[in-house]
């Protein structure tokens, strides 16, 4: 797995360099995240056909996976930091779950699956420390989790790669929205 | 597990009408999302039409959208197929299928539960 963000060769080899700010950090730590993404998504997608055939092979997805929407004041127009910075943190924590689900579903990557899933927790953390209303970020329920966890695993085979396509791919869209947000803060 | 008994098949004229019943026993039916498939001799299994597990939503394969209608009655355990119109080429033997998923397929690898089948042969 990729090295998490501040800890590569680079960062040691120049010790003058200015210091992150809260910003870049985020901005960093997303881009990373993406990374780790892109190889999961690579092994799902070579592993099986559902990145081509998974519009026709459903007619309906009830997984819930956390979407942008416009009243989430996250788009350029509407645009507001609060709504969206709370948005993003909760977002974020209702995909954990998913995250979870997403361990042990790799062969190869699976390094790469726990990157992206502690990553993600820290993540959440630097968002935390940036938002002002944290009283607004509703926490997903435990037992609720855990039992769509349960649920998700008993699946057949196809359901789970579908379902680990689907979270893949509504996870990159997430960060990137959430990413191209951020940068106007 | 889930048990899937289909009835109703037969021979019918082109144009005429035919009820299909799957009933269900075993587990919760309310929880499962149930389908019908069909396979016609040496061609594949085919998606004809699914119901949402409390029966509000249903999807239909375009070649039998406005023909063939999917219901259920979730207090006698069972999912029907209403065909109508029906052509020569709907012949074919009917399955009933399900599954217990947030993922509602129209690939026949996304069901769990399949029944024996029931023979519809649409001829004159």
């Known amino acids: 797995a990729p090295v998490p963000p501040g800890e590569d060769s680079k960062d040691v080899a120049a010790p003058h360099r200015q210091p992150l700010t809260s910003s870049e950090r985020i901005d960093k730590q997303i881009r990373y995240i993406l990374d780790g993404i892109s190889a999961l998504r690579k092994e799902t997608c070579n592993k099986s056909n559902m990145c081509e055939s998974s519009k026709e092979a459903l007619a309906e997805n009830n997984l819930n996976l956390p979407k942008m929407a416009e009243k989430d004041g996250c788009f350029q127009s509407g645009f507001n930091e609060e709504t969206c910075l709370v948005k993003i943190i909760t977002g974020l924590l209702e995909f954990e779950v998913y995250l979870e689900y997403l361990q042990n579903r790799f062969e190869s990557s699976e390094e790469q699956a726990r990157a992206v899933q502690m990553s993600t927790k820290v993540l959440i953390q630097f968002l935390q420390k940036k938002a002002k209303n944290l009283d607004a970020i509703t926490t997903p329920d435990p037992t609720t989790n855990a039992s769509l966890l349960t649920k998700l695993q008993a699946q057949n085979q196809w359901l789970q790669d579908m379902t680990t396509h689907l979270i893949l791919r509504s996870f990159k869209e997430f960060l990137q929205s959430s990413l191209r947000a951020l940068r106007q803060m | 597990d889930v048990q899937l008994v289909e009835s109703g098949g037969g021979v019918v004229q082109p144009g005429g009408s035919l009820r299909l019943s799957c009933a269900a026993s075993?587990?919760?039916?309310?929880?499962?999302?149930m389908a019908w498939f069909r396979q016609a001799p040496g061609k594949e299994r085919e998606f004809v039409a699914v119901?949402?597990?409390?029966?509000?939503?249903?999807y239909y394969a375009d070649s039998v959208k406005g023909r063939f209608t999917i219901s259920r009655d979730n207090a006698k355990n069972t999912v029907y197929l209403q065909m109508n119109s029906l052509r020569p080429e709907d012949t074919a033997l009917y399955y009933c299928?399900?599954?217990?998923?947030?993922?509602?397929?129209?690939?026949?690898?996304?069901?769990?539960?399949w029944g024996q089948g029931t023979l519809v042969t649409v001829s004159s």
């Open positions: 299928a399900a599954v217990d998923s947030p993922l509602i397929a129209t690939h026949p690898r996304g069901y769990d539960y």
């Open positions: 075993g587990r919760t039916f309310s929880n499962y999302a």
């Open positions: 119901i949402s597990y409390a029966g509000g939503r249903t």
